[in-house]
């Protein structure tokens, strides 16, 4: 009976996500059969988050809207380990919007989810950011420095990275 009610709860939770994500890939967390963590099927997972590389080229605002339609945001990078995971799935000749912008052109950078911007945990290419007109951040590859961040014009279409919390059922 307990197992039955647990299954019913899981099914109702899965239905919530079905409108965005018809298919989920779930893995057992730890040894307890009752705890499963899921990501939408084409997404990748790292720690407590799911990631999706959007290859459609859109402005920063449209990219963020595209992520939010899927129940996600443009990616907020909190650690070097997280960035190292993300770059495994990126193409060197492409640039990808991050969830980081400077809306007023005042060099006051902010993350889409209101995570405080910490200068000590940023991965800007050397000499970046460097332009008041470039209010949105991308991650891209430079042969001299590998992967890092750059500020660019928000309206210039780029690929993007979406991030959402894992779904626990």
């Amino acid at each position: 009976n307990f197992m039955y009610s647990k299954t019913v709860k899981r099914l109702s939770k899965l239905r919530e996500y079905q409108q965005y994500h018809p298919s989920l890939t779930c893995v057992m967390e730890g040894k307890d059969i009752e705890d499963w963590s899921c990501c939408p099927t084409p997404w990748t997972s790292f720690q407590s988050s799911c990631y999706f590389i959007s290859t459609g080229m859109q402005s920063w605002t449209k990219s963020q809207k595209n992520c939010s339609v899927m129940g996600a945001d443009l990616v907020v990078i909190n650690t070097r380990e997280e960035q190292d995971f993300i770059i495994q799935n990126l193409k060197r000749n492409s640039s990808y919007f991050l969830g980081l912008s400077d809306p007023g052109g005042r060099r006051h950078w902010q993350w889409v989810d209101q995570t405080p911007y910490n200068e000590n945990v940023t991965f800007w290419h050397s000499g970046e950011p460097n332009n008041l007109d470039e209010r949105c951040a991308i991650i891209n590859f430079r042969s001299s420095e590998e992967w890092g961040w750059n500020d660019i014009h928000c309206h210039v279409p780029q690929k993007s990275i979406c991030k959402m919390k894992k779904i626990y059922i």
Epitope: G105, R106, R107, N130, L132, H155
Partner: antibody, heavy 118, light 107 residues
Framework: QVQLQQSGAELVRPGVSVKISCKGS????????MHWVKQSHAKSLEWIGV????????NYNQKFKGKATMTVDKSSTTAYMELARLTSEDSAIYYC???????????WGQGTSVTVSS | DIQMTQTTSSLSASLGDRVTISCRAS??????LNWYQQKPDGTVKLLIY???RLHSGVPSRFSGSGSGTDYSLTISNLDQEDIATYFC?????????FGGGTKLEIK
Amino acid sequence: QVQLQQSGAELVRPGVSVKISCKGSGYTFTDYSMHWVKQSHAKSLEWIGVISTYYGDSNYNQKFKGKATMTVDKSSTTAYMELARLTSEDSAIYYCARNGNFYVMDYWGQGTSVTVSS
Amino acid sequence: DIQMTQTTSSLSASLGDRVTISCRASQDISNYLNWYQQKPDGTVKLLIYYTSRLHSGVPSRFSGSGSGTDYSLTISNLDQEDIATYFCQQGNTLPWTFGGGTKLEIK
């Protein structure tokens, strides 16, 4: 080539306002914000502020808030600066300058002389 | 606001000389230091940006160096057309600020 053409010299009475213009050509106007700089004998060069030609929003030096108002007209690729309630302290040469990479003003207008005198 | 100080307000040198103009910031400006040349007719041109990068079309006799709070502009082989006033400007923090200028004259 990049050119910033400013309006001509102004001789104005104290207490009135003046609006000076800066027409950008030879580049995509809305890709580069426009800065305004004051040069007076007493104070060398002073940064007044910057206006985004794309978004239309501005950042002012606190010292010039209430004195200067920056605007842009995308259709004519022209930036404007209005100076209000003029006094002799506002007599100076005013420059517009294009925003560039590395927090720099990469091209400058020829300057507009404003003389406030009764 | 960050204060920019050019201690030498005027400088006299001979044609062919090597001339150095210095600029000090009141705090670290992370190399966001630019140099401008103003000719006697009022024309202003960017020479050097981000401490040491030469703006397009600027002769290679101009060079820049420095870090932290201390920066300098060097003209290696003074030419008649270099007669002008030189200003430094920091772009690290709004409001952007300028040094008082150094007027260069020929002996």
